[in-house]
């Protein structure tokens, strides 16, 4: 065709995959009548008629474009819908009158790739490899045209470097005509790269301009030999008996070597291997003073069979031993003296305190408590507390009961009990003394004795209230080898209706169980007479 060499460059139309390309026929009125135009697609220099315009009416030719072409803009523009990568070619319109002229349009098609998918080499990379090893693979799917890949390490782009960095990219064409790009980064890494962040970036073009997508950042397992092994103890700081203590081996190599933890036997001075858990951690729970000693860790590289030993670490589990009080069960006559001595061992300086058990009152700061001119009130519990002031919570205590010889001491001398005839009354009587007294009652009934502590006893009596009992009252007698004492319970009849909350008496209620002689449960009130506690 004459004059073909002078043909102007085709007009460029850029469009994204799936959208509609508007192919505007650029013939001027002088070049041809737009009401009589043929449209061709050019592929590999072969033209194929795809559309005809006659008297302004369009008609698709049978073939791949048949369903996707339509006329717009009063016949000047051909619309191509559902653009695919295969549509990237030259389209031309040819006017027939007054003479045959052509207008060429270059259709460029674009498609952004999907987010790049990065996969790190799960096997990791040894630092001493002779040539670059596979670090990670980056895949960008379904882009068009082929995007460009750039690899980054710690935010800096990586360049090809002989024997150090090699980027190997390949692409495949999907049935859709889109490209999937695969890029493999190979590199020689050093120990410092164990924390390096790698990512890939896909650069691509759209009608709107240049764009890029970044993958997530990954770190690659870097394998390097162990140079140092050491022990770590948790918690840090002062340890005490009862704590949960973890001793673990650490190493600066990857993978870590096979660890074993040993403790020096204080007798033989030999290192004896300790049993660790599945994670190689020696858990001491609860820690005991016997766990104190010199620990060390051995790291064995199973590939090279090279063994490394940690610096030994001294572990001190602070303790307070069982507290011993002497005498352990003191018995004294009234008026005599008693010296209580408290002893304990500890890994730290100890402080001693003596407290009265019943009141919590601090009697002495120090290991020795001296009691003079003992009265019976001095009998009872004394507690020695041995503590380490520098370690909160590290203490042990021992309770000692001081027994003062004496006849029974009654909880009350006399007591008035309000009762109803025919009820079963539950009476109680308490006495203390050393030796521990026994209690008897002057009436028949069901009695049971309960030891409250080594010097105190409580007796309860279930008895039926009869007229005779109302007349005589009830006595309980406590006795031991040193004497006897009696408490009297006066029984007084009362109507249950008089037991109202606004009653002006001040003693508590004692519950009594109804016997077969009464129709319902009844309650009796025990009322103390206003006099001091009897002292025997």
């Amino acid at each position: 065709v004459p004059g073909e060499a002078e043909q102007p460059a085709p007009e460029l139309v850029e469009v994204e995959v799936g959208s509609t390309a508007l192919l505007k026929c650029g013939l001027s009125q002088s070049q041809g009548n737009l009401s009589h135009v043929d449209w061709f697609s050019v592929h590999k220099e072969k033209r194929t008629l795809i559309f005809r315009v006659r008297q302004g009416q369009g008609q698709s030719e049978p073939g791949e474009y048949e369903q996707r072409l339509s006329l717009q803009d009063r016949g000047a523009t051909l619309a191509l819908t559902q653009v695919t990568p295969q549509d990237e070619r030259i389209f031309l319109c040819q006017g027939k009158r007054p003479r045959s002229q052509e207008y060429r349009i270059q259709l460029r098609v674009y498609k952004a790739p999907e987010e790049p998918n990065i996969q790190v080499n799960p096997l990791g990379i040894p630092v001493n490899s002779k040539e670059p090893e596979e670090v990670a693979t980056c895949v960008g799917r379904n882009g068009y045209p082929i995007p460009q890949v750039i690899w980054y390490k710690n935010g800096r782009p990586l360049k090809e470097e002989k024997n150090r960095v090699h980027i190997q990219s390949s692409q495949t064409v999907e049935s859709s005509g889109l490209y999937t790009l695969q890029s493999i980064l190979k590199a020689q890494l050093v120990k410092e790269d164990k924390d390096a962040q790698f990512y890939c970036e896909l650069n691509y073009r759209l009608p709107s301009g240049n764009h890029m997508k970044e993958s997530r950042e990954v770190t690659v397992p870097v394998f390097y030999p162990t140079e140092k092994v050491w022990l770590e103890v948790e918690p840090v700081g002062m340890l005490k008996e009862g704590d949960r203590v973890e001793i673990r081996c650490l190493a600066d190599g990857n993978p870590p070597p096979h660890f074993s933890i040993s403790k020096q036997n204080p007798s033989t001075r030999e290192a004896e291997e300790e049993t660790t858990n599945d994670n190689g951690v020696l858990v001491l729970e609860p820690a005991r003073k016997e766990h104190s000693g010199r620990y060390e860790c051995q790291g064995l590289d199973l590939d090279t069979m090279i063994s490394l030993l940690s610096e030994p670490q001294e572990l001190l589990v602070n303790y307070v031993s069982d507290v011993r009080v002497s005498p352990a069960a003191p018995e004294r006559q009234e008026g005599s003296s008693l010296t209580l001595t408290c002893e304990a061992e500890s890994s730290q300086d100890l402080e001693f305190q003596w407290l009265r058990e019943e009141t919590g009152q601090v009697l002495e700061r120090g290991p020795v408590l001296q009691l003079h001119d003992l009265k019976r009130e001095a009998g009872g519990g004394y507690r020695c507390v041995a503590s380490v002031p520098s370690i909160p919570g590290l203490n042990r205590t021992q309770l000692v009961n001081v027994a003062i010889f004496g006849p029974p001491w009654m909880a009350f001398k006399e007591r008035k009990v309000w009762v109803k005839e025919n009820m079963v009354l539950n009476l109680s009587c308490e006495a203390s003394g050393h030796p521990r007294p026994t209690i008897s009652w002057n009436v028949n009934g069901t009695a049971s004795e309960q030891d409250q502590d080594p010097q105190r006893v409580l007796s309860t009596l279930n008895v039926l209230v009869t007229p005779e009992l109302l007349e005589t009252g009830v006595e309980c007698t406590a006795s031991n080898d040193l004497g006897k004492n009696t408490s009297i319970l006066f029984l007084e009849l009362v109507n249950l209706t008089t037991l109202t909350p606004d009653s002006n008496t001040t003693t508590g209620l004692s519950t009594s169980t109804a016997s077969p002689h009464t129709r319902a449960n009844s309650t009796s009130t025990e009322r103390k007479l206003p006099e001091p506690e009897s002292r025997g």
């Epitope: 069960a329 006559q333 027994a403 030796p435 409250q452 502590d453 080594p454 080898d481």
Partner: antibody, heavy 118, light 111 residues
């Protein structure tokens, strides 16, 4: 030093009586309990009775009630065990022992042998 | 009466051994933290000697290799490292109530 010394043992015919003595020294006699414990040859220990010299209160093992009697002489710091109607099975070493109010025996005499035999 | 059962009745051991003797009472001999159980050692031809009182307290002058433990009905006398002078018969005794009773004894012999 604290000491208990038994005496009065010997060979006696069945049905006869014997009085054992226990002399205390080195402690306040009336502040402690004195017990008798016996041990038949090759056998274990058996508690017999106790007395509190301060009040003269006594307790007996039911097994010996009626036949054995405890008494004391505070001026001599001595305790006595009167044994009547003796039987062959009463043959034993008789120990006196001291206790406080928790009834463990912290001081023992060396024992005196009683043999009941015809 | 409370019956005291000691086990074993006899035991052979060597110097340096750790030995444990147990005593079981037919009912509890403990009251509010106090256990009325005591241990004695007796050598042939001699009077018994108090070792442990109130279950776990070492009598003055008794070597610390002797220890006692337990509460309620089950009690243990332990000798941590047998010495030649420890070969003897051992008795437990309760004082929870009258009559006081002893175990039948455990004879500890040299192996």
């Amino acid at each position: 030093q604290v000491q208990l010394v038994e005496s009065g043992g010997g060979v006696v015919q069945p049905g006869r009586s014997l009085r054992l003595s226990c002399a205390a020294s080195g402690f306040t006699f009336s502040n402690y309990w004195i017990h008798w414990v016996r041990q038949a040859p090759g056998k274990g220990l058996e508690w017999v009775a106790r007395i509190y010299p301060g009040t003269d209160i006594t307790y007996y093992n039911e097994k010996f009630k009626g036949r054995f009697t405890l008494s004391r002489d505070n001026s001599k710091n001595t305790l006595y065990l009167q044994m009547n109607s003796l039987r062959a099975e009463d043959t034993a070493v008789y120990y006196c022992a001291r206790s406080g109010g928790y009834w463990y025996f912290d001081v023992w005499g060396a024992g005196t042998m009683v043999t009941v035999s015809s | 009466d409370i019956v005291m059962t000691q086990s074993p009745s006899s035991l052979s051991a060597s110097v340096g051994d750790r030995v444990t003797i147990t005593c079981r009472a037919s009912k509890s001999v403990s009251i509010s933290g106090y256990s009325y159980m005591h241990w004695y050692q007796q050598k042939p031809g001699k009077a018994p000697k108090l070792l442990i009182y109130l279950a776990s307290n070492l009598e003055s002058g008794v070597p610390s290799r002797f220890s006692g433990s337990g509460s309620g009905t089950d009690f243990t006398l332990t000798i941590s490292s047998l010495q030649p002078e420890d070969f003897a018969t051992y008795y437990c005794q309760h004082s929870r109530e009258l009559p006081y009773t002893f175990g039948q004894g455990t004879k500890l012999e040299i192996k």
